[in-house]
Interface confidence: low
């Protein structure tokens, strides 16, 4: 007799993350039997979602569903029907929605309310959408890059070795950028987290970690570029900035009302004499570079040292994984092979900066203008934060793995978020509260 | 389900200072600002302010700075409000309120009555 | 501050009959295209129940013969038809800016 193919045993998971300039669903599979295994969770599918983040449809709530259609029709499709019924679907969202919550609790509430009604009249298991705060980004991140580097696992593999995977079971250290937030996350060596805040503290696998952990809220890609922008032209003596952080002969005119609109620019607000401004680029990477550095507070710290702004940070460990824009930004510009040197990057980027406008634009036809226009300033202030922010060195940049996906799945904060809240990752409870929701509203 | 309790009543003299708390259960706790509000019976409802359970980072009413205190437990799922110097302008019924999701969830109540 | 000003003070009404309670700011509760005022209900003994907010929008399991209107300054609660657990007090409240306000409120009685 011919031996049938068995039904495959199989469970899925859906996560959405509600970043600040999108939000893309993320389907997870694994064999049902094997749900405490590590390493077994997979992602079988990424939908990017139309259309900004959720915190940008406060004025067009009602607009909230069908944004959300075609990447939750799409999860219909991947996901066999018979499992519709048992499929959890969760929504985290992250600092887009945190600055839309200190605006306004209300607003920011509003817009969940109708995602949370928009998802509910799908056929899957909706367990609710909210803003998770900067320290479970940080910590969920960790645990999905170490999740997928094998890096919780006591056993010896018999699959293809995992890339950036050394024998040793040291973890890395997690840094995730984003448009709104930058979090750093990594296992200090032997060295007291000094501040209770960027402390927590759980058990993987039956193993104790004790992990560092801060999210820079305004620091992310986007939301540093207004702070920079609204910090330079509190000295422009008129309605034209010049700015070093654009490419030679770009122009972009600017509303007041727009840069003033996030409170990440409150501290540079101030009464101008015109509505409007233009960014003239003149490319020099140096002088960007400078401009960064003064978002960055590091005349004051309170602890034995500190990344920037007062926050503690404690001495760098092992290898990091940088993942979302920090891959992103670093992939478009060519410099995520482990070869190339800090210094190499520098002159990657004095380079491209340099470069005219127009030139790029003939160079990199295919790239909308919005974002092709933006690689400079975000290139430099990825070296600017790591190297002034974080304090990585020249010698310490090659412990920096520019990492997109890991064995197929994304890098990010949201498969950990999933194993976590499916009790896919066995051990005691973990003794953090940021890492235990037993309850969703 | 969402619910917040509140500690029983109490008896103050004029002057002193009295502590009351608002404990949590049914949802993430660090995940929406607790709100105080005031309810005497000639004023109405008054809103006294909130906190932020993540960072402790607090919003008084002008009228309530130097009156009340907003502080929180984030272990044991715990607002409190302290009020000082008391008078008898003082005895009310304090409620605290689960912020966002527009005031939906209300405590109990703690009466408060100042007398000599 | 903004100041709401509640009216009427009292009112009663027959059991089957409809209730319009108004509420008028000093300023604008309008922001981002949404009205941030609410109706709340409060009977003796208990905590405010929230009714309406965003103006228009019923809260959670409250009675579809409740019903508010209104954007800007000028917001009505209509509660028809009047039901006998209907009698209580009935308070307006905007959280457009801080300080939080609310209206002095109404009392509902059955006629």
């Known amino acids: 007799t011919q031996n049938k193919a068995l039904p495959e045993n199989v469970k899925y998971g859906i996560v959405l993350d509600a970043g600040s300039s999108h939000t893309s669903l993320y389907i997870y599979k694994w064999p049902a039997e094997k749900e405490n295994d590590t390493g077994v969770v997979h992602q079988v599918e990424e939908c990017r979602v139309k259309g900004p983040g959720i915190s940008k449809f406060v004025q067009k709530v009602n607009e909230i569903g069908i944004y959300l259609t075609d990447c939750m029709e799409r999860a219909r499709e991947v996901i066999p029907r018979s499992q519709h019924q048992e499929t959890p679907v969760y929504l985290g969202a992250t600092a887009g929605m945190r600055l839309l919550r200190m605006e306004s609790e209300e607003l920011a509430d509003r817009v969940l309310d109708v995602v949370e009604r928009s998802l509910s009249n799908y056929p899957f298991d909706f367990q609710g959408a909210r803003i998770i705060t900067g320290q479970e980004e940080g910590a969920y991140g960790w645990i999905t890059i170490n999740y997928l580097l094998g890096k919780f696992s006591q056993k010896t593999r018999w699959f293809s070795i995992v890339p950036y995977e050394t024998n040793n079971q040291e973890t890395f250290g997690a840094l995730d950028l984003g448009g709104a937030s930058t979090q750093v996350t990594f296992v200090p060596q032997n060295q007291t987290i000094e501040s209770p805040d960027n402390a927590l503290q759980f058990r993987l696998y039956g193993k104790d970690y004790n992990v560092y952990t801060h999210s820079f809220l305004c620091y992310g890609k986007d939301q540093a570029l207004w702070q920079k922008l609204a910090k330079d032209i509190q000295v422009a003596s008129n309605e034209i900035l010049r700015d070093p952080c654009f490419h030679p002969g770009y122009k972009k005119v600017v509303n007041v009302s727009d840069l003033y609109k996030t409170p990440c620019t409150k501290r540079f607000e101030m009464t101008l004499p015109f509505q409007q401004f233009e960014i003239q680029g003149i490319g020099n990477y140096q002088q960007c570079h400078q401009s960064i550095l003064e978002l960055f507070n590091t005349s004051y710290c309170p602890y034995s040292q500190c990344a920037f702004n007062g926050i503690f940070l404690p001495p760098l460990q092992g290898d990091f994984g940088a993942f979302s824009a920090f891959y992103f930004v670093m992939k478009f510009l060519n410099l995520t092979s482990e070869k190339v040197s800090q210094e190499k990057v520098t002159e990657m980027m004095k380079k491209f900066c340099a470069q005219p406008w127009e030139e790029i634009k003939t160079s990199y036809a295919g790239v909308k203008e919005k974002y092709l226009s933006e690689y400079c300033f975000s290139g430099t202030y990825i070296l600017s934060l790591l190297l002034q922010g974080y304090h990585f060195t020249a010698d310490s940049w090659e412990h920096i793995h520019f990492i997109g996906k890991i064995q197929g799945s994304d890098a990010g904060w949201t498969l950990g978020y999933m194993l976590n809240l499916t009790n896919m990752i066995p051990a005691e409870q973990p003794l953090s509260t940021p890492l235990s929701h037993s309850t969703y509203v | 389900e969402v619910q917040l309790q509140q500690s029983g009543p109490e008896l103050v003299k004029p002057g002193a200072s009295v502590r009351m708390s608002c404990k949590a259960s049914?949802?993430?706790?660090?995940?929406?600002?607790m709100h105080w509000v005031k309810k005497n019976h000639g004023k109405g409802l008054e809103w006294i302010g909130y906190?932020?359970?993540?960072?402790?980072?607090?919003t008084y009413n002008q009228k309530f700075k130097g009156k009340a205190t907003l502080t929180v437990n984030t272990s044991s799922k715990t607002a409190y409000m302290e009020l000082r110097s008391l008078t008898s302008e003082d005895s009310a019924v304090y409620y605290c309120?689960?912020?966002?999701?527009?005031?939906?969830?209300w405590g109990q109540g703690t009466l408060v009555t100042v007398s000599a | 501050n903004i100041v709401l000003t509640q009216s009427p003070a009292s009112l009663a009404v027959s059991l089957g009959q409809r209730a319009t309670i108004s509420c008028r700011a000093s300023?604008?509760?309008?922001?981002?295209?949404?009205?941030?005022m609410y109706w709340f209900q409060q009977k003796p003994g208990q905590p405010p129940k929230l009714l309406i907010y965003a103006a228009s929008t019923q809260g959670s399991g409250v009675p579809a013969r409740f019903s508010g209107s209104g954007s800007g300054t000028d917001f009505s609660l209509n509660i028809h038809p009047m039901e006998e657990d209907d009698t209580a007090m009935y308070f307006c409240q905007q959280s457009k800016e801080v300080p939080f306000t609310f209206g002095s409120g109404t009392k509902l009685e059955i006629k």
């Open positions: 309120t689960r912020g966002g999701t527009r005031f939906a969830s």
């Open positions: 300023e604008s509760v309008d922001n981002y295209g949404i009205s941030f």
């Open positions: 906190i932020n359970p993540n960072n402790g980072g607090t």
């Open positions: 049914g949802y993430t706790f660090t995940d929406y600002n």
